[in-house]
């Protein structure tokens, strides 16, 4: 007996025994009613899920913030939060992330967000800029649609001092109902709902309550979500008595909320730990739960119904759950504007002393080599440029989205992803010398397929089973164009089966398309310069040393032959030893790229967020005048468009960064044809960032 206990102890302490994995999701409840529903949830799930499936345990805490702390401390696993609290959950030391989103509307067209709106009575005759002195109805203090968004947007219009915020809001409106506010310290916030009760006992609490506050004539404006009006007024004639206030100082009918809202707000979201957060288990649990107890599924227990209250555990208006892409952190999920609004509310920034000084541009550098060049640029720029590092291009794009970085230059394939993620192109790399380089954006460069002249039987039509070399997955010349053409031919995405092996940095590590790569250890097949076969030069090197075909740009071969690249692998190469594959099945010499290419590719472009566009544009134009191709001696001076290890930060053949004129969106910049081609290839996309961004903006 003693022996058995000892053995169990060893198992418990060292975790050495093959224990059954813990498949319990500890759900956090914030009230007696929620705890009751949670227990019912637990019991009903037990009755329908096999014993080896996910199960529910219930943990009761006093508040959502206590739940957030409990999850961070591994005392609970999941809770559903309003968007405002998702931000709190994200902040250190909590570090939680969104894992499952509630959706509204139909399964075919699921809405994972709602619109925060300002509703008024049709005959009230005031506009957004006349809200001061009006009476306001809020869903609750600190809630997204009812408080954070409207007050975040109005923040700089509030009377000074703006701290405490409740006092400033109380002085801005002539009276309010803001449930959950401190009625003792801020009686004006409770003027329209004595006591400011923080539950449904207060008739003006929550979405329906705030709307009732307006409907009863207590308030002049209600800050709610777009569906509140429809949920509370079934009759169109009744709805027609109300309008929405738009940010442009106009009004619109309530059904035009897509063109007249304060913000687009992510829906109620389940959060979990970023590390070891059981996100797959939580999804498995909720997915099974919605199958058995979702909308119109069961009489005995309903996930989206609260007989003992309202919105218990989940919103009563929810129709189901969607898995949040694993790539998404809270900042990305909430969106840059929403996060900025909350941050502004908390940090209290306003243009009191208007300034147009551009803050330093934070450039995103990939891996070690780019960071070294960026740091050199930063020193030479005397503080105009700062550097931020990331391991992959997608990590950089994510950092630009959430404000940790501001800009970087991207291949067209990544301009597409960045565009889908809400970034904008601001300047284009230009590769042709001309008198007016900065004003003359080019049509693009050519994507080509290069082979060794000695492999004389190789053509575009018999590439199956050959060894391929790519700049990286998701890049234009190295992936999107050749794989897009290939997809049209083979009608499937199993490119790793089409080629016998290859190097396509960014592929799954166990893929045959990582087999030819040369990076050591963890750097093998990584989409950055730590992988020797990454980028244009890397893909060409891969062809020289191991491959049958390289997908690169038309300048790659001349740039690395005839002694132009002094590296040992390249110094003795001759351009005449290579040929191009043409789409008609013929081959041509390298210099005949204009008549033998796969497609024209858009030039690389600098991308940024909309709000940084002007500063990035201005500072980069200054920087290229100082360090651009006008600098003749790069041995003693910093040169922006030169690299030790090829194409660092910008392509080395960049002559200047050119204005885009009217090609100032990613669609216009890339062109309809290319956008369509990449769109088709999205079926094959392994981009977790693209998945995450199209989750917010389909």
């Amino acid at each position: 007996m003693r022996l058995a206990v000892g053995a169990l102890l060893v198992c418990a302490v060292l975790g050495l025994c093959l224990a059954v994995p813990d498949k319990t999701v500890r759900w956090c409840a914030v009230s007696e009613h929620e705890a009751t529903k949670c227990q019912s949830f637990r019991d009903h799930m037990k009755s329908v899920i096999p014993s080896d499936g996910p199960s529910v345990a219930c943990v009761k805490k006093a508040s959502y913030l206590d739940c957030i702390r409990a999850i961070a401390a591994n005392e609970a696993d999941a809770v559903t939060l309003d968007a405002g609290l998702v931000y709190d959950a994200y902040l250190a030391p909590n570090n939680l992330k969104p894992v499952v989103a509630e959706f509204y509307g139909s399964k075919e067209d699921p809405q994972t967000f709602y619109y925060a709106v300002a509703v008024v009575k049709k005959d009230s005759g005031f506009q957004m800029n006349q809200l001061r002195g009006k009476k306001s109805c809020h869903t609750g203090l600190g809630r997204s649609a009812g408080w954070n968004i409207p007050i975040g947007l109005l923040y700089c219009d509030l009377p000074e001092p703006r701290k405490p915020l409740e006092k400033a809001v109380a002085n801005f409106f002539s009276g309010s109902c803001a449930p959950c506010a401190d009625g003792t310290d801020f009686p004006q916030l409770c003027q329209l709902c004595p006591g400011c009760g923080c539950s449904t006992l207060n008739q003006y609490f929550g979405y329906s309550g705030a709307f009732k506050c307006l409907k009863d004539g207590a308030g002049d404006v209600a800050f709610v979500k777009h569906s509140t009006i429809f949920e509370n007024l079934a009759n169109k004639a009744d709805r027609d008595q109300y309008e929405l206030l738009c940010l442009d100082n106009t009004r619109k009918p309530v059904d035009e909320y897509k063109d007249c809202h304060l913000a687009q707000v992510p829906s109620h979201t389940v959060v979990a730990r970023s590390m070891g957060g059981k996100e797959d288990l939580i999804w498995e649990l909720l997915n099974q739960a919605q199958e058995h107890f979702g909308k119109d599924k069961s009489k005995e227990f309903q996930l989206f119904s609260s007989p003992h209250g309202k919105d218990l555990l989940f919103k009563d208006s929810a129709h189901g759950f969607l898995k949040v892409p694993p790539r998404m952190d809270a900042k990305m999920y909430l969106g840059y504007e929403y996060v900025t609004a909350i941050r502004n509310l908390r940090e209290g920034t306003c243009p009191e002393a208007p300034t147009d000084e551009c803050k330093p541009v934070k450039w995103c550098a990939l891996s070690h080599h780019e960071r070294l060049k960026c740091d050199e640029w930063s020193v030479n720029s005397v503080g105009k440029i700062e550097c931020v590092s990331a391991e992959t291009t997608e990590d950089c794009i994510a950092k630009i989205m959430n404000g940790e970085a501001d800009a970087m230059s991207l291949d067209g394939g990544f301009v597409y992803i960045a565009g889908k993620c809400g970034l904008v192109p601001v300047l284009a790399e230009n590769y042709n010398k001309s008198d007016n380089c900065e004003d003359t954006p080019e049509a693009g460069y050519f994507a080509i397929a290069v082979v060794k002249k000695s492999a004389s039987d190789l053509t575009w039509d018999n590439l199956k089973g050959k060894k391929s070399c790519h700049t990286a997955v998701g890049r234009t010349a190295g992936w999107n164009i050749p794989m897009g053409l290939l997809y049209n031919k083979i009608n499937h995405c199993r490119f790793d089966e089409f080629f016998s092996e290859g190097c396509a940095p960014g592929s799954k590590k166990d893929s045959s398309l990582c087999k030819l790569c040369m990076g050591s250890g963890l750097n093998l097949c990584e989409p950055n310069n730590k992988e020797g076969y990454y980028g244009y030069t890397g893909a060409f090197r891969c062809l020289v040393e191991k491959g049958d075909v390289a997908f690169v740009k038309h300048q790659t071969v001349p740039q690395n032959t005839g002694g132009k690249n002094p590296d040992p692998w390249a110094k003795n190469l001759n351009e005449k030893d290579y040929e191009l594959l043409c789409l008609d099945g013929t081959r041509k010499p390298v210099e005949e790229y204009a008549n033998c290419h796969l497609a024209r590719a858009p030039n690389h472009a600098v991308v940024t967020r909309k709000d940084k566009e002007a500063c990035v544009h201005k500072i980069l134009r200054q920087q290229q005048h100082l360090f651009g191709s006008n600098v003749t001696d790069c041995s003693g001076n910093f040169c922006l468009f030169r690299s030790e290890t090829k194409d660092l930060l910008f392509r080395d053949d960049t002559v200047c960064l050119a204005k885009l004129h009217d090609r100032n969106t990613y669609e216009k910049y890339l062109g309809e044809e290319y956008v369509k081609a990449v769109g088709n290839l999205r079926k094959c996309s392994t981009s977790s960032l693209l998945e995450a961004c199209t989750f917010r903006r389909p």
Epitope: M128, D248, N344, P351, D611, E613, A614, H617
Partner: nanobody, 125 residues
């Protein structure tokens, strides 16, 4: 750096006119929403007018019919033509830009991310 510089302010009698200009240097503002705000001494800054890239405009009720906003994208310049001026129009006038693609405009201060230093307009009775 990127700058918005207002000019054209001054003193004028009630009923008179003024034209304010705001020149943007360092960037073409064709995709920004541009606006004028004003702040009277001891008062809160208030929105006056906005103009979208496509030329659509919006005005506060207090200036409707008297003020006209316009922009010349080729010259990177925003204008505010003020007629039938009243003593209550006395204020510091600020030019502001919001980078949102230029397809939508706002009346709220917090949505504008670039501001000029202002030009004073004084209307005496």
């Amino acid at each position: 750096d990127v700058q918005l510089v207002e000019s054209g302010g001054g003193s004028v009698q009630a009923g008179g006119s003024l034209r304010l200009s705001c020149t943007a240097s360092g960037y073409t503002y064709s995709r920004a929403c541009m606006a004028w705000f004003r702040q009277a001494a001891g008062k809160q800054r208030e929105w006056v007018s906005w103009i979208i890239a496509d030329g659509s405009t919006g005005y506060a009720d207090s200036v409707k019919g008297r003020f006209t906003i316009s922009r010349d994208n080729a010259k990177n310049t925003l204008y505010l033509d003020m007629t039938s001026l009243k003593p209550e129009d006395t204020a510091m006038y600020y030019c502001a830009a919001a980078y949102n693609g230029g397809d939508r405009c706002y009346t709220l201060i917090g949505l504008y991310n670039h501001w000029g230093q202002g030009t004073q307009v004084t209307v005496s009775s």
